[in-house]
Interface confidence: low
């Protein structure tokens, strides 16, 4: 039975050209970690393996930093960059948990991020 | 165990400047982030920047191009070069730091005061 839930920074905007982090977290399950995928839409990201560490897709190398923790940091942002993001945990034994988040990217400094992850 | 002390903190003037230093124990600094985090009275605690060993930086919309947050990874120490400094950058200052692996950012220092006031 899968009790995890999985909190994220939800709808976020942010200005052309600067820096966001995308973050969620699973919380209320003792299942392990065993791999965080990112996605974009359809294109993978970034895999966080629990025992390999980080791999970032070829196409985002120059614009995607790991972390902070199991979130993605992506930089250099263009207004190509607003969509849909996606954070998969794989997890033992629950099985697969989806987390969701809206990047709008801005082209003029009305950015605003729409929601804080909540720091325990 | 994981420590982290910060130091660095004090009373400044509009317009002044500080440096905030946080001293890591416990883990070597590498596939990790540190950052500074902050708390004003009645406010959700904020990241404010973050770096990682290979040098990835972070910065919230607020400090850029005020703030510059650095580390020596020999020295296993994060910094935080603050200029320009505004009174609402008053709160207390926390280091933090992300094994990478397991809750985000789950290793906190005791928070250093920035008061900026005239």
């Known amino acids: 039975m899968m009790t995890g839930t999985i909190e994220t920074t939800g709808n976020i905007s942010a200005e052309k050209g600067g820096s966001i982090i995308l973050q969620c977290h699973l919380s209320s399950t003792t299942a392990q970690v065993t791999q965080v995928n990112w996605e974009q839409q359809d294109q993978l990201l970034a895999i966080c393996n629990a025992d390999l560490g980080w791999h970032i897709s070829p196409s985002f190398k120059d614009r995607v930093a790991p972390g902070p923790g199991l979130g993605l940091t992506l930089q250099s942002l263009t207004v190509n960059d607003t969509g849909e993001y996606f954070c998969i945990y794989h997890t033992y034994p629950d099985g697969t948990y989806t987390g969701r988040i809206f990047l709008e990217v801005l082209e003029s400094s009305v950015a605003e991020h729409g929601a804080r992850f909540q720091i325990p | 165990e994981v420590q982290l002390v910060e130091s660095g903190g004090g009373l400044v003037q509009p317009g002044g400047s500080l440096r905030l230093s946080c001293a890591a124990s416990?883990?070597?600094?590498?596939?990790?982030?540190m950052g500074w985090f902050r708390q004003a009275p009645g406010k959700e605690r904020e990241l404010v920047a973050a770096?990682?060993?290979?040098?990835?930086?972070y910065y919230a919309d607020s400090v850029k191009g005020r703030f510059t947050i650095s580390a020596d990874n020999s020295k296993n120490t994060a910094y935080l070069q603050m200029n320009s400094l505004k009174p609402e950058d008053t709160a207390v200052y926390y280091c933090?730091?992300?094994?990478?692996?397991?809750?985000?950012?789950?290793?906190w220092g005791q928070g250093t005061l920035v008061t900026v006031s005239s």
């Open positions: 416990g883990f070597t600094f590498d596939r990790s982030w």
């Open positions: 933090a730091a992300d094994v990478w692996y397991g809750s985000t950012w789950r290793n």
């Open positions: 770096i990682t060993s290979g040098g990835s930086t």
